[in-house]
Interface confidence: low
């Protein structure tokens, strides 16, 4: 019969034959012949390969280095990575997360749209008219000024995005 | 029909050699892997060497291994075992075995050793 | 070397009764396209070994179905569902997964 051109799933042409791939978690040991099989044989510890391959050497999982604020999120298997994120107050900086760093904080005049995450940066806003904030902050929010008139003041000193309005007693001397 | 048919044994002494053959017939002998398989008087069956369809590949026992070669000739439909270096526990009768398959898609499933020779006496003696 | 270990070694048997053969081995001989390498053969006194089961479960051509094979991974078993005169000789195990391929020591199962 010919030769075939190509194989079925979970196989590979090798020597004009279709082989069986070796299982995720195994790697390649030998190509199958007309008489034996495939050879695989299990990743070693710290070790994966997550598809169906013809690797012959399992891929080391991916170190969390704690000297650049990483922690284990997730434990490898023989099948999976590991997966890293960051310490407490501290981002990914990439998709990789590779590394980390400080989470970003929003100056005075800017607040806090989205608390950042152990893979995102914190996103900061401009405090709109009526709004302000007067620290430098990773989680503070933008906050309203003060309502003079439900407390039955007025206002002596006008807000800007970065202090609140002063307030004061009513002028009660004019008739 | 499908038809294996070894020769080649007899009494021969420690240190000599012997060619085993097996004539195949009733099947495209050149599409087969084909093994050697023996069994010492009264003892189980111990699996000797086998090759590829063409020949390329060869793997052999270890306690044969360095004294023991398969071969092949296609075109005489013919396998070969030559036994080299013989000793007193090489004494056995030699089977010439197909390794069966079928064909699909360029893969081989495999059938089992579907055919087996009668079987050749191999006597080593002093 | 993969290593097959059977039991019993010898098992004697009435006519129509039946009979069971278990064969353990050291690995795993479920393959990843899901058949397990595993075959069964007979020996028939004075005769040479005969092919009976392939790939743990398959009935070899012209091997009556009183003959079945089961189990997976490293326990295996041969059945014979009501043993016939002509039934009689030493079984073995194969493993068909690596090369060097190995059997298992035999069984013999003799008429009670």
């Known amino acids: 019969p010919e030769p075939p051109t190509a194989c079925r799933e979970k196989q590979y042409l090798i020597n004009s034959q279709c082989c069986s791939l070796c299982q995720p978690g195994q790697k390649l040991v030998s190509d199958c012949t007309e008489f034996t099989e495939t050879e695989c044989l299990p990743c070693g510890e710290s070790e994966f390969l997550d598809t169906w391959n013809r690797e012959t050497h399992c891929h080391q999982h991916k170190y969390c280095d704690p000297n650049l604020g990483l922690r284990v999120q997730q434990k490898g298997t023989s099948e999976t990575d590991t997966i890293c994120t960051c310490e407490e107050g501290w981002h990914c900086t990439s998709e990789a997360c590779e590394s980390c760093v400080l989470h970003r904080s929003c100056s005075p005049g800017f607040g806090v749209k989205q608390i950042a995450t152990g893979v995102s940066d914190t996103i900061c806003e401009p405090c709109p008219v009526g709004f302000f904030s007067n620290v430098s902050s990773a989680f503070e929010k933008c906050h309203p000024w003060t309502s003079c008139e439900t407390k039955d003041l007025v206002v002596q000193q006008a807000g800007t995005n970065k202090t609140d309005v002063v307030c004061g007693p009513q002028d009660r001397l004019r008739a | 029909q499908v038809q294996l048919v070894e020769s080649g044994g007899g009494v021969v002494q420690p240190g000599r050699s012997l060619r085993l053959s097996c004539a195949a017939s009733?099947?495209?002998?050149?599409?087969?892997?084909m093994h050697w398989v023996r069994q010492a008087p009264g003892k189980g069956l111990e699996w000797v060497a086998v090759?590829?369809?063409?020949?390329?590949?060869?793997y052999h026992a270890d306690s044969v291994k360095g004294r023991f070669t398969i071969s092949r000739d296609n075109s005489k439909n013919a396998l070969y075992l030559q036994m080299n270096s013989l000793r007193v526990e090489d004494t056995a009768v030699y089977y010439c075995?197909?390794?069966?398959?079928?064909?699909?898609?360029?893969?081989?499933?495999?059938?089992?050793?579907?055919?087996w020779g009668q079987g050749t006496t191999v006597t080593v003696s002093s | 070397d993969i290593v097959l270990t059977q039991s019993p070694l010898s098992l004697p048997v009435t006519p129509g009764e039946p009979a069971s053969i278990s064969c353990r081995s050291s690995?795993?001989?479920?393959?990843?396209?899901?058949?397990?390498?595993l075959d069964w053969y007979l020996q028939k006194p004075g005769q040479s070994p005969q092919l009976l089961i392939y790939l743990g479960s398959n009935r070899a051509s012209g091997v009556p179905d009183r003959f079945s094979g089961s189990g997976s991974g490293t326990d295996f078993t041969l059945k014979i569902s009501r043993l016939e005169a002509e039934d009689v000789g030493v079984y073995y195990c194969m493993q068909a997964l690596q090369t060097p391929r190995t059997f298992g020591q035999g069984t013999k199962v003799e008429i009670k």
């Open positions: 009733g099947f495209t002998f050149s599409s087969y892997g």
């Open positions: 090759i590829s369809k063409d020949g390329g590949n060869k």
């Open positions: 690995q795993s001989l479920l393959y990843s396209n899901g058949y397990n390498f």
């Open positions: 075995v197909r390794r069966g398959h079928q064909l699909v898609l360029g893969y081989y499933y495999y059938n089992g050793l579907d055919v």
